[in-house]
Interface confidence: low
C-alpha cells in the first residue's frame, strides 16, 4: 500500500505566439482545479477507460479575475498535493492523465459552469520510494509543470511497496546489523549500506555503496544545498535541476495531511489545514458534496435537498469504492457456469457458453438432440455439450447419412472373406477357422 503524490507547480500559456493570455475572461471570475487519473502499466491513456490505479481531484484554486491591460500574472493554483492512495503493489510502470478544469463563477442558473481547459497524458516508469520526478507537458497552447512520486505507507517498503518490514515485539532472531522483516518470521533483511558519509537526511541509496541525493541537495554525499535562485515555483516539492531547497526533516516531512491538506509544525507535533470538503486530524474525513464533483469513471453523484449533505456515488457497472475509483474484476466471481468464458465488457458482463449450454450465465443445459435427426434409423446420443449419432448397420457419418462399407475395416480374421449383407456383414472363414469374425 502507498500513495501517489502529484504537485502542480504552474499552469499557464505555453511559449510561442498565439498563446492565450488567461483561462479566465475579464467578464467572469474563475478558478482552476485539477484531476489526475492513474492506470497501471503502459496502457492506453484514453480518458474514458477506467482509472484502475485510482484518481484524485484537487481543491479549487483561488478566484482569479483578469485585469484588462495588466500583465498576465502566474495563475493562482490550488494548495496542496493531489494524492492517489493505492492498496496493492505499485506497478512501476503507469499511465497518467492530468486534467485542468476551469470553474466560471458567474450568475449561471443552477450553479457554476465547468469546462475542461487542458488534458495531458503520459506513460512513465517510477519506483516507489524514489525522489520527486519533475515533468513539463503541453496541451495545445497551455503548459503544465508538475512533480510526482510514489511512496509506500508503513509498514510497506520496497520499489513496489510489497514487502512489509517492521520491528517485531518478540526478541529478534536476526543477527547483528540485520532487521526483522514481516510477514516471514525468520526472514531477515540486510539494510542497504550507502556510501560512507552519505547524508542520512538528504541522501539515499538503492544499491550498496551509492549515495543519491534528494531534490535540493547535491555533492558526493548530498550535504550541499543547491542554489535557490532558479526555483520555478516557491511552493511544493523541489528539484535538483531547478535548485529548490527541501527543508530538513521534521514532523511535516512526507506531508501527513491527506487530501491536499497543508501541514504546519507546532511545538509538539504538526497541524493540518484542510481544503474545503475535508476535516479531521489529517484531513482524512471527507465532507465533500456533489458540487465538488467527487465521482469518477462516470459515477453519478447524488446529494439530497440540503446543500451541505453528504454525497453518495452510484458507480456504473464495473466500478466500486466510495468515489467509483476502483475497477471491479467481475469475472473473478466466476459468474459463468458450465465452463462458460466470462467477458467483462465494462458496461456489461457477457458469458460465452460452451456448445450445449445457453442463458445469460450459461445456466441452461440444452437438449443436444433437440431438432437434430439421425438419418437411416440412427439414434441420437446426447453428452458433453454435443450430440452424436449411433448409426444403424451399413450407415455412418455425423448424421448417419453416409453409406458405410461394413467390410472396409477388414473385420474377418485369419484370412476370412467379408461379404456385405443388408443385415450387416458375413465372414466366409478360411479352412480351420470359425466364428462370426473367424476368430476361433
Amino acid at each position: 500500500a502507498g500513495v501517489f503524490e502529484l504537485q502542480i507547480h504552474s499552469f499557464g500559456p505555453g511559449p510561442g505566439p498565439g498563446a492565450p493570455r488567461s483561462p479566465c475572461s475579464a467578464r467572469l471570475p474563475c478558478r482552476l482545479f485539477f484531476r489526475v487519473c492513474l492506470k497501471p502499466g503502459l496502457s492506453e491513456e484514453a480518458a474514458e477507460s477506467p482509472c484502475a490505479l485510482g484518481a484524485a481531484l484537487s481543491a479549487r484554486g483561488p478566484v482569479y479575475t483578469e485585469q484588462p491591460g495588466a500583465p498576465a500574472p502566474d495563475l493562482p493554483l490550488p494548495d496542496g498535493l493531489l494524492q492517489v492512495p493505492f492498496r496493492d503493489a505499485w506497478p512501476g510502470t503507469f499511465s497518467f492523465i492530468i486534467e485542468t478544469w476551469r470553474e466560471e463563477l458567474g450568475d449561471q442558473i443552477g450553479g457554476p459552469a465547468w469546462s475542461l481547459l487542458a488534458r495531458v497524458a503520459g506513460r512513465r516508469r517510477l519506483a516507489a520510494g524514489g525522489p520527486w520526478a519533475r515533468d513539463i507537458q503541453r496541451a495545445g497552447a497551455w503548459e503544465l509543470r508538475f512533480s510526482y512520486r510514489a511512496r509506500c505507507e508503513p509498514p510497506a517498503v520496497g520499489t513496489a511497496c510489497t514487502r512489509l518490514c517492521r520491528p517485531r515485539s518478540a526478541p529478534s532472531r536476526c543477527g547483528p546489523g540485520l532487521r526483522p522483516c514481516a510477514p516471514l518470521e525468520d526472514e531477515c533483511e540486510a539494510p542497504l549500506v550507502c556510501r560512507a558519509g552519505c547524508s542520512p537526511e538528504h541522501g539515499f541509496c538503492e544499491q550498496p555503496g551509492e549515495c543519491r541525493c534528494l531534490e535540493g541537495w547535491t555533492g558526493p554525499l548530498c550535504t550541499v544545498p543547491v542554489s535557490t535562485s532558479s526555483c520555478l515555483s516557491p511552493r511544493g516539492p523541489s528539484s535538483a535541476t531547478t535548485g529548490c531547497l527541501v527543508p530538513g526533516p521534521g514532523p511535516c516531512d512526507g506531508n501527513p495531511c491527506a487530501n491536499g491538506g497543508s501541514c504546519s509544525e507546532t511545538p509538539r507535533s504538526f497541524e493540518c489545514t484542510c481544503p474545503r470538503g475535508f476535516y479531521g486530524l489529517r484531513c482524512e474525513v471527507s465532507g465533500v458534496t456533489c458540487a465538488d464533483g467527487p465521482c469518477f469513471n462516470g459515477g453519478l453523484c447524488v446529494g439530497g435537498a440540503d446543500p451541505d449533505s453528504a454525497y453518495i456515488c452510484h458507480c456504473p457497472p464495473g466500478f466500486q469504492g466510495s468515489n467509483c475509483e476502483k475497477r471491479v474484476d467481475r469475472c473473478s466471481l466466476q459468474p459463468c457456469r458450465n465452463g462458460g468464458l466470462c467477458l467483462d465488457l465494462g458496461h456489461a458482463l457477457r458469458c460465452r457458453c460452451r456448445a450445449g449450454f445457453a442463458g445469460p450465465r450459461c445456466e441452461h443445459d440444452l437438449d443436444d438432440c433437440a431438432g437434430r435427426a439421425c438419418a437411416n434409423g440412427g439414434t441420437c446420443v446426447e453428452g458433453g455439450g454435443a450430440h452424436r449419432c449411433s448409426c444403424a448397420l451399413g450407415f455412418g457419418g455425423r448424421d448417419c447419412r453416409e453409406r458405410a462399407d461394413p467390410c472396409a475395416a477388414r473385420p474377418c480374421a485369419h484370412g476370412g472373406r467379408c461379404y456385405a449383407h443388408f443385415s450387416g456383414l458375413v465372414c466366409a472363414c478360411a479352412p480351420g477357422y470359425m466364428g462370426a469374425r473367424c476368430e476361433f
Epitope: G111, C290, A291, L300, C301, V302, A305
Partner: nanobody, 127 residues
Framework: QVHLVESGGGSVQAGGSLRLSCAAS?????MGWFRQAPQKEREWVAT???????????YYVDSVKGRFAISQDNAKNTVYLQMNSLKPEDTAVYVC????????????????????WGQGTQVTVSS
C-alpha cells in the same frame, strides 16, 4: 429523446391522499417531481434513481419527508409519487422530470440537472 406523461392529479380534502404517475418513453438515470404553486418558485419535491445502477435510491425535500413516497416500476418505465396527509400548502402543479444525460455531477434539487419535463398535473388540497 424521452417523452414524459403524468397522471393522477385532482382535488382532495386536507389529510387525504393522491397517487401521481409518470411514464417515460425511454431509459433514464433519475426521475423526479417538482411543483409550482401560483406566484411561487418551482420547488423540487422528490427524485428516485431509475437506472439499474441506482436500486431505487430515493431523495425528498424536507417538507414532504414521511408524507410522500416515491417508487418505481422499471418494467413499465414509470415512477409514482404517493402523497399522504396532504396539506393545503401542497396545492400546486406537479411536474415530472427526468435525467437522461450521463455526467459525474448531479445535484438533484437543481432543475438544471434534468433534461426532460412533462406537462404537469394539478393537485388541489382544500381545507
Amino acid at each position: 429523446q424521452v417523452h414524459l406523461v403524468e397522471s393522477g392529479g385532482g382535488s382532495v380534502q386536507a389529510g387525504g391522499s393522491l397517487r401521481l404517475s409518470c411514464a417515460a418513453s425511454g431509459y433514464t438515470y433519475f426521475m423526479g417531481w417538482f411543483r409550482q404553486a401560483p406566484q411561487k418558485e418551482r420547488e423540487w419535491v422528490a427524485t428516485i434513481g431509475t437506472g439499474d445502477i441506482f436500486n431505487g435510491a430515493a431523495y425528498y425535500v424536507d417538507s414532504v419527508k414521511g408524507r410522500f413516497a416515491i417508487s418505481q416500476d422499471n418494467a413499465k418505465n414509470t415512477v409514482y409519487l404517493q402523497m399522504n396527509s396532504l396539506k393545503p400548502e401542497d396545492t400546486a402543479v406537479y411536474v415530472c422530470a427526468a435525467v437522461q444525460s450521463k455526467s459525474s455531477n448531479y445535484v438533484l434539487r437543481d432543475a438544471s440537472t434534468y433534461n426532460y419535463w412533462g406537462q404537469g398535473t394539478q393537485v388541489t388540497v382544500s381545507s
